[in-house]
Structures are given as structure tokens and as C-alpha cells.
């Protein structure tokens, strides 16, 4: 006989990354006639919900209006069919931005390169902080882990058209508060002898289309559960 | 902005009752999630009970068949109905208010609160 009902899926919308005293909606996904929905937060409960009618309902939103830093960290969802639980959804590591300060990104050689060469991003920061992240527009799993006291060094390597796009940089306070971002770089690559034709560029937004870009960049996981373990999210692991 | 004031408190001896409200101003208060927090000396404030836009309820384990939450969106009050009450039922009683918010929400942890009351003392004694 089954113990325990299959875990549900946990997601947020618009995104995972929220900049502070913004609203943000953490979803969860059971089964229909779930009649108790609970959301915890670093092990301890959070908030419930009893969807109304439960078979017909297999989802309910959390909503948080005024996201801060005591809220920032890792939820978990369970939901209950009579008196059978089901196991834990999956972590979701829930990030507040806009903390602080804002720090600086650059790029050598330059924002301009020839395919093959080598490029490094720069992102400082002169406040406390000794973690930095950086990300490329458009999708979220590009991001990079970097250390150093004021400022961290992210080397791309030698580089293709596939890393052309838009770049940002954050300084983290700890896994789940980090920085403004910083101003976007745009790296152009030219050049490339490989058939660039086959090296797809990502969507990039232009600078004061940041704030879109951090409500519609996870669109696509949240649609498919199956992909939402992606890198952002294991990297704050 | 959300103001929260509470009142009901007193003394009270133990087996007693006693009604908390909180009055909530402003036109917000159809659409928030509100909740009962108390805070006992030297100890770290605890989720007492909550109750979502819709009326759905829910209780600490500690006061369960013993307090009852209800709200009056005519009157833009919350209420705590506290029965058969304990000596470690004694502290200071904080409204609490989650706006705006979805419907069948119930808020457990105080970091979910975005607006609190300044609190009201309850005392329980012989």
C-alpha cells in the first residue's frame, strides 16, 4: 500500500529572482483532490492553502507582496489527499535582489572580439560581500559562481558567436540576497570560421528592459516542471 | 498603509476567556490575510493562529479546540477568541496583516506579515 503520495512541483512566478519589496507567487503543483496545499520555508511552515473545489483544483498559488531578505531562502511544498501526504516537492532557492549596493561590470580586452580570443568579465564591488555572480540575458542557466574580496574574475575563455549576448553581474551577501545588477555589457563576437549560422545568439534585451527580462526569463522552465532543477537553481546549492 | 490596533487584553484567571480584537484601517482589509502572533517574556515570538481572506483558519497546535479566529470585513476588525486559557498562555498578543493576497491563503510564519499591530498584553494568573 502507498505511504506517501508523488511530490509536487514548486515553482515561482515571474521569477525566482526578486528584486526586494516586489511581489512574487510561488506555485504548487499536486493533485487534484488535494484538499491541504502547506508551503515551507527553511524547514519550518510557512502558509497553507485548501483549494476550493479540491477535484478540481490541481495547483495553488502562494502570493508574497512585499518580498525581503527574511524571506529569501529555500521553500518546499507538500499537499494531503484525505489523510495521505505526499513527499516534498523540490528545493526552490528563492533570491532577493536590489540589495545594497551596485557593481561594477567590465570586460577585456573589450566589448568587441574576434571569435578565438580570449575574454575575461570583471565584476567589482566595494562592499562586503566576497561572492559574485554573473549572467548572461535570456537564459537563466547562464550564470557563473565567482570569489574575491572586492571583485571577481569570470574568464570565458576562448570565445564563439554562441557567447555573444547581453552580460550582468551581481554581488551576493550571502546564497540568497544579492546586489542591484550591474550595468549590462554587451559582448559582440565576429568572425567566427565555423558556420555561425549554427551557433544560435540569445535573446537579449536592451538595458532598461532588465526588469522584463527578470519576469519572462524562467517562462519557459515553469512551463515544463520537468526542466525546472536547471543550473540557476543547482548553483545557489 | 495598513494601521493595526488591538485591544481585549487584561488579566484573567486560569479556565477563563477572553476576546482580542484588531482593527484594521484603511480599504484593504477584504483583501488581506490576518493573523495572531504572541510573544511571552524571554521567549521568541510564536504563531498563535491565521485566517485567510476566505475564512479558511488555521491554529498553533498549542491552542487548538481553545481559540477561535474570526474576522468581520464589515467592521474591519480580526478577532481572537481565547478560552479555557493557561498561565503559559500569558504575553503580549501582536494583529498581524498579509496585504494584498490571494484568496484561500493562510500565513503561518511572521515573516510573511507585512504589517503588524503594536500588541496587547494578556495576562493569565491565579
Known amino acids: 500500500q502507498q505511504q506517501t503520495l508523488p511530490k509536487p512541483f514548486i515553482w515561482a512566478e515571474p521569477h525566482f529572482m526578486v528584486p526586494k519589496e516586489k511581489q512574487v507567487t510561488i506555485c504548487c503543483q499536486g493533485n487534484y483532490g488535494a484538499v491541504e496545499y502547506q508551503l515551507h520555508f527553511e524547514g519550518s511552515l510557512f502558509a497553507v492553502d485548501r483549494p476550493k473545489p479540491p477535484e478540481r483544483i490541481n495547483k495553488v498559488q502562494f502570493y508574497i507582496p512585499d518580498m525581503n531578505s527574511r524571506m529569501a531562502g529555500q521553500y518546499s511544498c507538500i499537499y494531503r489527499v484525505g489523510e495521505l501526504w505526499s513527499e516534498p516537492s523540490n528545493l526552490l532557492d528563492l533570491v532577493v535582489t536590489e540589495m545594497y549596493d551596485t557593481p561594477t561590470l567590465s570586460v577585456h580586452p573589450g566589448p568587441e572580439v574576434i571569435s578565438g580570443e580570449k575574454v575575461t568579465f570583471y565584476c567589482r564591488l566595494d562592499t562586503a560581500t566576497s561572492m559574485f555572480l554573473l549572467l548572461k540575458e535570456g537564459r537563466s542557466s547562464h550564470v557563473q559562481r565567482g570569489y574575491g574580496k572586492v571583485q571577481a574574475e569570470f574568464p570565458l575563455g576562448p570565445v564563439t558567436t554562441a557567447h555573444r549576448g547581453t552580460y550582468r553581474c551581481f554581488g551576493s551577501y550571502n546564497n540568497h540576497a544579492w546586489s542591484f545588477p550591474s550595468e549590462p555589457v554587451k559582448l559582440l563576437v565576429t568572425g567566427d570560421i565555423e558556420n555561425t549560422s549554427l551557433a544560435p545568439e540569445d535573446p537579449t534585451f536592451p538595458a532598461d528592459t532588465w526588469g522584463t527580462y527578470l519576469l519572462t526569463t524562467e517562462t519557459g522552465l515553469q512551463k515544463d516542471h520537468a526542466l525546472w532543477d536547471h543550473t540557476a537553481q543547482n548553483l545557489l546549492r | 498603509e495598513v494601521q493595526l490596533v488591538e485591544s481585549g487584553g487584561g488579566e484573567v484567571q486560569p479556565g477563563g476567556s477572553l476576546r482580542l480584537s484588531c482593527a484594521a484601517s484603511g480599504r484593504t482589509f477584504a483583501s488581506a490575510a490576518m493573523g495572531w502572533f504572541r510573544q511571552a517574556p524571554g521567549k521568541e515570538r510564536e504563531f498563535v493562529a491565521a485566517i485567510s481572506r476566505s475564512d479558511d483558519t488555521y491554529y498553533a497546535e498549542s491552542v487548538k479546540g481553545r481559540f477561535t479566529i474570526s474576522r468581520d470585513n464589515a467592521k474591519n476588525t480580526v478577532y481572537l477568541q481565547m478560552s479555557s486559557l493557561r498561565a503559559e498562555d500569558t504575553a503580549v498578543y501582536y494583529c498581524?496583516?498579509?496585504?494584498?493576497?490571494?484568496?484561500?491563503?493562510?500565513?503561518?510564519?511572521?515573516?510573511?506579515?507585512?504589517?503588524w499591530g503594536q500588541g496587547t498584553l494578556v495576562t493569565v494568573k491565579p
Open positions: 498581524a496583516a498579509v496585504v494584498p493576497t490571494y484568496g484561500s491563503n493562510i500565513y503561518v510564519h511572521s515573516a510573511a506579515y507585512n504589517y
